[in-house]
């Protein structure tokens, strides 16, 4: 059959009927009726909230939709213990205390469930000491503290500020530097726009909002207790002593005005440079303890979270394929959310649910897709993606057969000023090609294309005319999907302008005044972004699930390799002495980058030329596209990283947001000169080049002609 | 449009009394920390004292401590300076300021200003 | 309480003429700086806040600069409408906020 016998539509009109049939106003509707009460995970309100997601899709014309639960492990404070964080004097009396709860936004003074800021997973605790300000609590902020300002962590509580990296990494460097304690706050520097009101009365955090978030150090585990398998009713689980991920010491998250009182009176160390400074009222000083007159006060947390095995739903609708249903085309995005969620996930789920609606009116007209797409709601994505990753856990073998590519589906905007694409460099050509043919939602570009407005306000910093793409990092559901099944995958929403607007990521994010009316008040009254995400996505979905030849450019891939060959060896060449002194060579890397290149460019030849009206040749060459990012899946993972698989990127071991590429090479040299031992050490280095040459060249040998 | 209108200026002598008002318009009253900076004639801008959104929170300058008064009436969108024992040394313009909210933490810098009232204390 | 000390008190200047303005705060005070535009018989009018960012329908041809002790204003033409006396302001440690004694611009 061709791919469109099944269908009444026309070919040409197929992806105009669809992107037609999305509209501003059902997004709208949908994120309200998503955001009016909080949808936790593991609570009765996400659960109820899975069924009529459910209910919905089946209406809306999916051939099935399912509930798919799993037993995981989530954490959440004590109701009748609050967590809090004291000053203490010298008799122990607290003599300040930081805030319970956030004030709520006008309008939900009366919501029940909302719950308090906490850092999820923090273990129990009431540890007391002084106080060290530790910056952001990267890498190289404990690098300058220890190395050069010659400051010790062990048994101190360090307070540090979110942004630059997610919030486990802090943990996991603090705990290692030795801290007994962890305290987050905001600071007006990362998260309160310049000539921005605070909510209510603009976009910007309010002095009493927090962001909530886990704490873990997963690296792709999943549920903590069952790594690599499905949380389900005969799964066998860890002991607490054994699960992966957790953090050993309590951690606790504050907004500014409670950090202001904590941080004004700090002593000891002046801070290094001007980048330690936020924009607190306060001198940060990184102490340790507090100056003079306030010497003898101490820090006191007080940790009362538990954590307990709850069940979680995720919704799965599938629009079986009239020609290749056994090849899976998936779009997927979280439904819990910290409490509102009017931008994290809702504004991603309303816009997945109108996609659901246009692909279900086409179907009910009599259309279908040559290829199968699922549909995913996915359960606690905020305690650490486990829903998508459980799911893809028990799913996995049927995944990695038949799943052709992943577009995640998360929170369509945290800004309204361009578009923001991170994907496969499979995606390149697809992502080019569609916003070519979509309108522009900014203002000054009327009658422009999508892709010329993002062109413009976000160039690639390599070729001219042509957008920014990101590598894939994690944080999110794709990770699964990408890091260890090795399906291709991307994500796009709507961003800020990342050259004037240099908070992190937007200034509401995990707190209670992420709420419908901060959406539709101040980043897109018109819903005319969400509609350009929701054509974005849905249009990537289409061609991928609808196209006869799939709409990767494996010469994409090459041009990257290239660049990331390029880069690693540089990083590397600042150690000449000791490359030439242990051998070391990149020649095996260049090489099989280079014959990555002339294959992937002769197979594109014969992608041009042959005969597509043959089902099994047709077939053929739409596996070799398919298993292309299969191929540089290392079955062995990554050092220490087994849930990590893929050799050109993964997660940075400093940021889990961020990509890595050549992760094991890079992670092999991080910090290089600090090794004990450097033979050792530069034997992984060696070793590391050895696995990414030949992952580099055994991918290169899938897109060969077969025989 | 924001308005700021300044009222109850005039001439007073030493030790004498004065209540000046600031009319406001054009904003969510609520939301704003409001103030009064003054200005000697010939001289530069004084802080005199402001107080919170809600008016729970008030501030003054060491030199009218004790003498001086802010207030406001949020139902009637008014701001308030109850001045007592004037000296000699408080004859200036008197403008009723608003906090812009530009600073996330404490006061602000004042984006919106009256046209000012003048006090004279002479005998 | 934290000084603000301006200079020049006065300078003269033409139009089409670059000027900057100094304040020096007493301590650190962050970025927490602002500068007013004050002209004769009216209300100060605030230029610029958190020592560089522009208030809204302030000319472009007023920046600043600045943070710990030691900020600037800069005119980077002067035109006619500009005549007038500069004050800073910091709001870092508040109350008080306090000016300083501000720089009289006038015509060459």
């Known amino acids: 059959k061709s791919s469109n016998e099944a269908t009444n539509i026309t070919p040409k009109h197929n992806m105009k009927a669809f992107l037609d049939e999305l509209k501003a106003e059902n997004i709208k509707k949908f994120l309200y009726n998503f955001t009016q009460i909080p949808h936790l995970a593991g609570t009765e309100q996400n659960f109820q909230l899975a069924k009529q997601i459910q209910s919905q899709w089946k209406e809306f014309g999916l051939d099935s939709v399912e509930l798919a639960h799993y037993d995981v492990l989530l954490s959440y404070p004590n109701k009748t213990h609050p967590n809090y964080i004291s000053i203490i004097n010298e008799d122990g009396n607290e003599i300040f205390n930081t805030s319970l709860f956030e004030p709520p936004p006008p309008g939900y003074e009366n919501v029940s469930d909302i719950v308090p800021p906490f850092s999820a997973f923090s273990p129990q605790g009431m540890p007391e000491g002084d106080l060290v300000y530790v910056n952001y609590a990267r890498t190289e902020d404990f690098f300058k503290l220890e190395r050069d300002m010659k400051i010790n962590c062990s048994g101190k509580i360090v307070i540090a500020r979110y942004g630059k990296v997610f919030r486990g990494n802090k943990v996991k460097n603090a705990q290692l530097a030795g801290a007994k304690g962890v305290i987050l706050y905001s600071d007006p520097a990362d998260y309160f726009a310049p000539g921005v009101k605070s909510y209510p009365d603009g976009w910007n955090l309010p002095g009493g909002g927090v962001q909530r978030g886990n704490i873990l150090n997963l690296n792709g585990a999943g549920d903590p207790l069952t790594p690599g398998y499905p949380a389900n009713e005969y799964a066998y689980r860890r002991g607490i002593a054994e699960a992966v991920g957790l953090p050993s010491i309590p951690v606790h998250p504050i907004g500014y005005y409670d950090a202001q009182k904590l941080l004004e009176k700090m002593g000891g160390s002046a801070p290094p440079d001007s980048s330690w400074r936020g924009s607190l009222k306060v001198p940060y000083n990184v102490g340790p303890g507090f100056t003079g007159n306030f010497s003898t006060q101490k820090v006191k947390m007080h940790i009362h979270s538990t954590n307990e095995v709850t069940r979680i739903y995720n919704v799965i609708g599938t629009l079986r394929g009239a020609v290749e249903p056994d090849r899976y085309v998936i779009l997927g995005g979280h439904r819990d959310s910290w409490v509102f969620g009017g931008i994290d996930p809702q504004s991603g789920a309303a816009v997945v649910h109108e996609i659901v609606r246009s692909f279900g009116t086409l179907k009910k007209e009599g259309w279908r897709p040559r290829r199968t797409i699922l549909f995913a709601s996915w359960d606690a994505e905020e305690f650490g993606l486990l829903g998508s990753t459980e799911w893809a856990e028990e799913n996995s073998r049927l995944l990695q057969e038949r799943g052709v590519a992943y577009i995640n589906a998360d929170s369509s905007i945290e800004g309204n000023y361009t578009l923001r694409v991170d994907c496969t460099p499979l995606m390149y050509s697809l992502v080019h090609n569609l916003t070519k043919e979509l309108k522009s939602p900014d203002e000054g570009f009327e009658g422009k294309s999508l892709y010329e407005s993002w062109t413009k306000k976000s160039p690639s910093p390599e070729f001219s005319g042509m957008p920014r793409i990101s590598k894939l990092g994690s944080g999110n559901d794709f990770e699964v999907f990408f890091q260890r099944l090795g399906i291709a995958s991307g994500r796009a929403r709507y961003t800020k302008n990342w050259e004037t607007n240099k908070f992190s990521g937007y200034p509401l994010y995990h707190s209670v005044y992420e709420t419908y009316e901060l959406v539709e008040k101040f980043y897109d009254p018109m819903f005319k972004y969400h509609l350009t995400v929701a054509q974005v996505r849905g249009g990537m979905v289409f061609e991928l699930a609808n196209s006869i030849v799939l709409p990767f450019d494996c010469r994409d891939y090459a041009v990257v390799l290239r660049k990331y060959a390029d880069k690693i060896y540089s990083i590397s060449m600042k150690h000449p002495q000791e490359m030439k002194t242990y051998s070391v060579s990149f020649d095996s890397l260049f090489s099989a980058v280079k014959n990555f290149t002339e294959i992937a460019s002769k197979f594109s030849e014969r992608l041009q030329d042959f005969d597509k009206s043959n089902p099994i040749v047709l077939r053929m060459m739409n596996d070799q596209l398919m298993f292309l990012e299969r191929a540089f899946i290392d079955p062995l993972g990554l050092p220490d990283r087994p849930f990590y698989r893929h050799v050109i990127y993964a997660p940075s071991s400093h940021n889990k947001y961020a990509g890595e590429s050549f992760p094991g090479i890079y992670d092999a040299l991080f910090d290089i000169e600090s090794k004990v031992d450097p033979s050792k050490a530069w034997g992984e280095v060696k070793r590391q080049i050895y696995v990414a040459a030949f992952t580099v060249q055994a991918a290169a040998e899938t897109l060969s002609e077969v025989a | 449009e924001v308005q700021l209108l300044e009222s109850g200026g005039g001439l007073v002598q030493p030790g004498g009394s004065l209540r000046l008002s600031c009319a406001a318009s054009?904003?969510?009253?609520?939301?704003?920390?409001m103030g009064w900076v003054r200005q000697a004639p010939g001289k530069g801008l004084e802080w005199v004292s402001s107080i919170s959104g809600s008016g729970g929170s008030t501030y003054y300058a060491d030199s009218v401590k004790g003498r001086f008064t802010i207030s406001r009436d949020n139902s009637k969108n008014t701001l308030y300076l109850q001045m007592n024992s004037l000296r000699a040394e408080d004859t200036a313009v008197y403008y009723c300021a608003r906090d812009s909210g530009y600073d996330p933490i404490g006061f602000s810098p004042s984006d919106y200003w009256g046209q000012g009232t003048l006090v004279t204390v002479s005998s | 309480d934290i000084q603000m000390t301006q200079s020049p008190s006065s300078l003269s200047a033409s139009v089409g003429d670059r000027v900057t303005i100094t304040c020096r705060a007493s301590q650190s005070i962050n970025r927490y700086l602002s500068w007013y535009q004050q002209k004769p018989g009216k209300a100060p009018k605030l230029l610029i806040y958190a020592s560089s960012n522009l208030e809204s329908g302030v000319p472009s041809r007023f920046s600043g600069s600045g943070s710990g002790t030691d900020f600037t204003l800069t005119i980077s033409s002067l035109q006619p409408e500009d005549f007038a006396t500069y004050y800073c302001?910091?709001?870092?440690?508040?109350?008080?906020?306090?000016f300083g004694g501000g720089t009289k611009v006038e015509i060459k």
């Open positions: 054009g904003f969510t009253f609520t939301s704003y920390a």
């Open positions: 302001q910091q709001s870092y440690s508040s109350p008080p906020l306090t």
